[in-house]
């Protein structure tokens, strides 16, 4: 079990998909919309999980994802039989400092070139996605086809 160095603050980044849509917070829901003037895309807060020994290896870097400065984190939970993506009021550093991984808030971050995917740790095979139509909420999907976009561009701010 490698001991990760303790980090005091999460990294910050911006996200857009291959259609240059950005993530915007609307009524406590994240939606993907084309970038426009006077628009305020969310800044993502992300931090690696300190406890990787109980998580699958070689699936990606397990990270917590939040909205910077808003005390909101992305999590996956079942509604009925369907895994869904939700925003929960949670301090990302509280998750990071736990003595155990909190799988429902964790995502395997994989990078291929400039593209990033975010796979749910709690529901393997389910990825953060946006509908190809745009203006739609972020979702979790198993279907990695044309209907949904699961590839995102992640730009680290600092």
């Amino acid at each position: 079990m490698e001991k990760a160095l303790k980090i005091d603050t999460p990294q910050q980044g911006s996200i857009q998909d291959i259609n240059h849509r950005v993530w915007v917070l609307q009524d406590q829901t994240l939606i993907a919309v084309p970038r426009k003037d006077r628009m305020s895309p969310v800044t993502i807060a992300l931090i690696s999980c300190r406890h990787v020994e109980t998580l699958e290896k070689d699936r990606g870097n397990p990270i917590y994802l939040g909205l910077n400065g808003l005390n909101l984190c992305l999590m996956c939970a079942k509604v009925g039989d369907q895994p869904t993506l939700q925003l929960k009021e949670k301090d990302i550093m509280d998750l990071y400092n736990q003595p155990e991984p909190v799988k429902s808030f964790l995502f395997y971050h994989s990078q291929s070139g400039r593209n990033s995917t975010f796979e749910s740790v709690a529901f393997p095979g389910w990825f953060i996605a946006v509908s190809s139509e745009g203006g739609c909420p972020l979702i979790l999907t198993q279907e990695l086809g044309k209907a949904n976009t699961t590839d995102f561009g992640l730009t680290m701010l600092f």
Partner: antibody, heavy 121, light 111 residues
Framework: QLQLQESGPGLVKPSETLSLTCTVS??????????WGWIRQPPGKGLEWIGS???????YYNPSLKSRVTISVDTSKNQFSLKLSSVTAADTAVYYC?????????????WGQGTLVTVSS | QSVLTQPPSVSGAPGQRVTISCTGS?????????VHWYQQLPGTAPKLLIY???NRPSGVPDRFSGSKSGTSASLAITGLQAEDEADYYC???????????FGGGTKLTVL
């Protein structure tokens, strides 16, 4: 066979600091995969996790006790220790040390025999 | 009041089957955390009995079995024997409280 043995005073006065040491034999406290923990059990009651430590020095404490607890490790002696300050009668309990093994969540797979600490003047 | 709820006591005659339940919530067992079980014989330290919901450490008889569903778990003991008389504790982790949590314990009496 891994063995853990608690040692320390059996009687502590109110407001003083409780100090216990756990000596590990039959295995190395410096194993990368394990944490080492303290759990207590008041007489006739259930179990309460106090905190855990990794040989690297990383510690996790029960938030309800965090302001009073310090756990440290001495890899050269294969020991880890507990200090609990400002004790009251409510801290009277059998104190156990245990190995904390990887699982989801972690599991206490080897336990010491326990030592009764009474807080009384 | 324990975060994980167990019945205070259960009983059974030798040879019978008994079950002990452990009920949690969405921030512990329901969040996907496994449940571990410990046996504490009178006057002794707890001993790991079941880990990861259903796995037995070496030396634990297959009369002991565990299961988990949703926000609860259970321990089953078949072919009850006099030496099974003990306190049994379930354990998991609660991410809201940030603590390893134990059930209040269940005293098993073999009649």
């Amino acid at each position: 066979q891994l063995q853990l043995q608690e040692s320390g005073p059996g009687l502590v006065k109110p407001s003083e600091t409780l100090s216990l040491t756990c000596t590990v034999s039959g295995g190395s406290i410096g194993s990368r995969s394990y944490y080492w923990g303290w759990i207590r059990q008041p007489p006739g009651k259930g179990l309460e996790w106090i905190g855990s430590i990794h040989y690297s020095g990383t510690t996790y404490y029960n938030p309800s006790l965090k302001s009073r607890v310090t756990i440290s490790v001495d890899t050269s002696k294969n020991q880890f220790s507990l200090k609990l300050s400002s004790v009251t009668a409510a801290d009277t309990a059998v104190y156990y040390c245990a190995r904390v093994a990887p699982s989801y969540p972690r599991v206490f797979d080897y336990w010491g025999q326990g030592t009764l600490v009474t807080v009384s003047s | 009041q324990s975060v994980l709820t167990q019945p205070p006591s259960v009983s059974g005659a030798p040879g019978q089957r008994v079950t002990i339940s452990c009920t949690g919530s969405s921030s512990n067992i329901g969040a996907g955390y496994d449940v571990h079980w410990y046996q504490q014989l009178p006057g002794t330290a707890p001993k790991l009995l079941i880990y990861g919901n259903r796995n037995r450490p070496s030396g634990v008889p297959d009369r002991f079995s565990g299961s988990k569903s949703g926000t609860s778990a259970s321990l089953a003991i078949t072919g009850l024997q006099a030496e099974d008389e003990a306190d049994y504790y379930c354990q998991s982790y609660d991410y809201s409280l940030r603590v390893y949590v134990f059930g209040g314990g269940t005293k098993l009496t073999v009649l």
